[in-house]
């Protein structure tokens, strides 16, 4: 198969990646699965430059990213190392807050209204961003 050389319709290209920005809300797991069905993953933020790009497109709206600690340590969905990687948490976050009354803590990360990150209850229906890679992302043969 050949490599994907341009982004799908309605996706935005930036720095050899393609991004899709939702306009509706889903729980984190449903957003995660939506991206999988698109041969993509929830956005993985690896630099300040990528942070600013995503922030510009989502505006001041709570939006899921591909970062969670549902199995213990914080993990990016594509395997990018969390400990050594880019972070942009709000002050005193993540805090795994239990005071929301919804049961459990907070295991999924999202962009807040100022772009900085917060951990929240994964069931909240936030918008989300899918990301896939150009060049190495796809083996799909071109349409004839």
């Amino acid at each position: 198969g050949s490599e994907r050389t341009c982004c799908p319709v309605n996706w935005v290209e930036h720095e050899r990646s393609c991004y899709w920005f939702s306009r509706s809300g889903k729980a984190w797991a449903d957003a995660d699965n939506y991206c999988r069905l698109e041969d993509a993953h929830l956005v993985v933020v690896t630099s300040w430059e990528e942070q600013k790009f995503v922030q510009h497109h989502i505006g001041p709206v709570n939006t899921w990213m591909g970062l969670h600690d549902q199995n213990g340590p914080w993990k990016w969905v594509d395997g990018t190392d969390y400990e050594t990687g880019f972070k942009n948490w709000r002050p005193e976050q993540p805090d795994d807050w239990y005071g929301h009354g919804l049961g459990g803590g907070e295991d999924c990360a999202h962009f807040t209204d100022d772009g900085r990150w917060n951990d929240d209850v994964c069931q909240r229906p936030y918008r989300w961003v899918c990301e896939t890679e150009l060049d190495k992302a796809s083996q799909e043969p071109p349409l004839l």
């Epitope: 699965n33 069905l37 698109e38 993953h41 969905v77 594509d78 896939t132 890679e133 083996q139």
Partner: antibody, heavy 124, light 113 residues
């Protein structure tokens, strides 16, 4: 030609461990998600686990979560399944299968090539 | 988890006749964004691994004879063999890839009458 060759099966006592391997050839291994599917004797197919092409994310059936670990070595074109705390109900033929998806960072969940399988028997 | 329910459990069809297998999913497997149904069909003969026949409910895998066809959308799907050949005697499984865990139906055994 795509080839998948499983090995590592055998007889093990309940509570024991086993590591299955799947040697892959004939395609760009690092660009393909891979999966383990099992089939108990005389029964149907059960999806066990999957891993994305770069090895960065894995998925498990509830029946094996916390006991089985899927991994891959892309430099050796090999997929693994480490099986711990084995139970009698884990007895099955274990198939390695290639995901037909187009992305190295996602699992499509449809399997276009399968190995011949390796039999795991858990019995005392 | 999505439960896949085939019907019938088994069927016997004369060679050259049509065989039809149905599969119902407990929830829709249609992804509205791309209008794809995440439903596949596999054939398994005794002592062999499964073989992918159909994916996205109706797309035939490369090399699969055109007597095999898939149809349906949402929760109801059909695999048809237009003219049963002796080599088609096998167990046929439907499988959803819409959500994880991926799940297979129990299978339908097709014999010749």
């Amino acid at each position: 030609e795509v080839q998948l060759l499983e090995s590592g099966g055998g007889l093990v006592q309940p509570g024991g461990s086993l590591r299955l391997s799947c040697a892959a050839s004939g395609f760009t291994f690092s660009s393909s998600a891979m999966t383990w599917v099992r089939q108990a004797p005389g029964k149907g197919l059960e999806w066990v686990s999957a891993i994305i092409g770069n090895g960065g994310r894995a998925y498990y059936a509830d029946s094996v979560k916390g006991r089985f670990t899927i991994s891959r070595d892309n430099s050796k074109n090999t997929l693994y399944l480490q099986m711990n705390s084995l139970r009698t109900e884990d007895t099955a033929v274990y198939y390695c299968a290639k995901d037909r998806g187009y992305s190295r960072i996602a699992v499509a969940g449809t399997f276009d090539y399968w190995g011949q399988g390796t039999l795991v028997t858990v019995s005392s | 988890d999505i439960v896949m329910t085939p019907s019938p459990d088994s069927l016997a069809v004369s060679l050259g006749e049509r065989a039809t297998i149905n599969c119902k999913s407990s929830q829709s497997v249609l992804h509205s964004s791309n209008n794809k149904n995440y439903l596949a069909w596999y054939q398994q003969k005794p002592g062999q691994p499964p073989k992918l026949l159909i994916y996205w409910a109706s797309t035939r895998e490369s090399g699969v004879p055109d007597r095999f066809s898939g149809s349906g959308s949402g929760t109801d799907f059909t695999l048809s063999i237009s003219s049963l050949q002796a080599e088609d005697v096998a167990v046929y499984y439907c499988q959803q890839s819409y959500t994880i865990p991926f799940t297979f139906g129990p299978g339908t055994k097709v014999d010749n009458k």
